[in-house]
Interface confidence: low
């Protein structure tokens, strides 16, 4: 056993190169000073090590450095990242954005996995805040980034980060992710004129409230019936015909189309019939001509 | 987006060298290693080796030991594969390939070079 | 070196039929398998690594399992495309080898 373990005459790694590849594992455990794996770190990614060999390597960065690596050690990790759990991630400290991009790199086009969503996490809580050249980062390597964080992780997002925010990166994100963007996104474009700043607050508006929606209506904005299907219903109800007809401009006839899905049907049933009969599509389901219409709402507050 | 653009079609007498070479881009061409896989007409696929874009390192397969000779030029970010001493049986197609996640599985590939020897 | 032998050499299935095909390794290579489909003039395609873990963007019925040295790739409700010839390779050790390939015919 003792002599399985010592490293054969010869053998001693000088410097991490291609010979080590026909290394057994014990040969590698014995021959390789785990100093000089970690200061030649850079050249371990393009020699296609065996995923044996790699778990090697990472046991003698384990022993090196039980507290968890230093940065010059992380940064050139390469697919060694991929041997890494959770559990080891969670004793890094990673303040670099080079290192968070050189680590994503090696998982890009895949699914976000454990470990990138430690190191993340790990990075984020780091910086104190989701700054704009990691928002930037993150979701370049993952669209729908953004939309897997809690409300309250959003809320450490700065109104600033909004600018790197692509319409593709709230696809997935639920109404109440938007609530929390929705007020940030109004903040960072509030500067911009009437039709830049729907542009850019579009992709948002699945937050936002009545009264904003009234104003955006007074705007000539031609909202798509895509964004419109998106509003959250409590906001669109209190809607009237005509500002709906002005939110939604041309595209007013995309609500035939749509008449049984929410929010448009739960908007109708809202409406007076001879209200939404002046659109002309043929939408049913209105409040009956000659019915009164109570605000309850109202009433109860009233009360 | 990551791309290997493989030299054209090449065809050899018995007893010639061909140099395949394969340019590279979308990636940093020294960060990662490259393989060569052919394909003889018909067959399946043979692996002969790789190179370390990064130190010039090779491993080649026992097979084509003392034939095949795998060179980089890191300015052009582009790999060559010459293979010498041609027989017909080394009519081909000879691709490069780029791994994508560790561990040797071949995820970029080359569009392929068909290499025929015929006198 | 790890020999891969692939069974069966050919299939001919139908659409919306379930498709086997088993690569079996001459010694232990871990789970260090991949597939890969290649159409007739094309490069082969990634579909599966790690013996099961399937290759972002591959349709979902495909998928891969293991038990000791021998590997399956299975094709649920195959479809016209599905049409192409899979080849296993291992890369536990080198060479890094390739089963024989198994071509899979729609009928």
């Known amino acids: 056993e003792v002599e399985k373990t010592a490293c054969p005459s010869g053998k001693k790694a000088r410097e991490i190169d291609e010979s080590l590849i026909f290394y057994k594992k014990w040969e590698l455990e014995a021959c390789v000073d785990a100093a000089l794996l970690a200061t030649q770190m850079d050249r371990v990614n393009a020699i296609p090590f065996t995923y044996e060999q790699l778990d090697v390597l990472k046991h003698k960065l384990d022993e090196l450095y039980p507290q968890g690596y230093p940065e010059s050690v992380i940064q050139h990790l390469g697919y060694l990242f991929l041997k890494m759990s959770p559990e080891d991630i969670r004793k890094w400290n990673v303040t670099s954005l080079e290192t968070l991009k050189a680590l994503l790199e090696v998982n890009k086009g895949h699914e976000m996995s454990p470990q990138v969503a430690t190191l993340i996490d790990r990075f984020v809580k780091g910086r104190g805040q989701l700054d704009k050249d990691t928002l930037d980062t993150l979701t370049a390597f993952y669209p729908g980034y953004l939309c897997s964080l809690s409300p309250e992780e959003l809320s450490s997002v700065p109104p600033s980060s909004i600018w790197a925010v692509r319409p593709q990166d709230l696809d997935t994100c639920d109404p109440r992710q938007l609530d929390v963007l929705y007020p940030k996104a109004r903040l960072a474009f509030q500067n911009m004129n009437g039709s830049e700043y729907f542009v850019k607050i579009q992709s948002f508006l699945g937050g936002a409230p009545t009264e904003d929606l009234k104003a955006l209506s007074q705007q000539n904005v031609s909202m798509d019936l895509a964004t419109f299907m998106k509003l959250r219903t409590d906001a669109v109800l209190p809607l009237t015909v005509a500002e709906v007809q002005k939110l939604l401009g041309p595209h007013v006839e995309g609500l035939k189309a749509e008449e049984r899905h929410r929010p448009v049907r739960d908007w109708i049933l809202r409406q007076r019939q001879d209200d939404l009969d002046t659109l002309g599509l043929g939408l049913q389901g209105g409040i009956p001509n000659g019915y009164l219409v109570l605000d309850l709402s109202m009433q109860e507050a009233l009360s | 987006q990551v791309q290997l653009q493989q030299s054209g079609a090449e065809v050899k007498k018995p007893g010639a060298s061909v140099k395949v070479s394969c340019k590279t881009s979308g990636y940093p061409f020294t960060g990662y290693s490259l393989h060569w896989v052919r394909q003889a007409p018909g067959q399946g696929l043979e692996w002969m080796g790789w190179?370390?874009?990064?130190?010039?390192?090779?491993n080649y397969a026992q097979k084509f030991q003392g034939r095949v000779t795998m060179t980089r030029d890191t300015s052009i970010s582009t790999a060559y594969m010459e293979l010498s001493r041609l027989r017909s049986d080394d009519t081909a197609v000879y691709y490069c390939?780029?791994?994508?996640?560790?561990?040797?599985?071949?995820?970029?590939w080359g569009q392929g070079t068909l290499v025929t020897v015929s006198s | 070196d790890i020999q891969l032998t692939q069974s069966p050499s050919s299939i001919s299935a139908s659409v919306g039929d379930t498709v086997s095909i088993t690569c079996r390794a001459s010694?232990?290579?871990?789970?260090?398998l991949a597939w890969y489909q290649q159409k007739p003039g094309k490069a082969p395609n990634l579909l599966m690594y790690d013996a099961s873990t399937l290759e972002d963007g591959v349709p979902s019925r495909f998928s891969g399992s293991a038990s000791g040295t021998e590997f399956t790739l299975t094709v649920n409700r195959l479809q016209p495309e599905d049409s192409a010839t899979y080849y296993c390779?291992?890369?536990?050790?080198?060479?890094?080898?390739f089963g024989g390939g198994t071509k899979v015919d729609i009928k």
């Open positions: 390779q291992q890369y536990n050790s080198y060479p890094l080898t």
């Open positions: 010694q232990d290579s871990g789970t260090w």
């Open positions: 390939a780029r791994d994508h996640y560790g561990g040797n599985s071949l995820f970029y």
């Open positions: 190179i370390n874009p990064n130190s010039g390192g090779t």
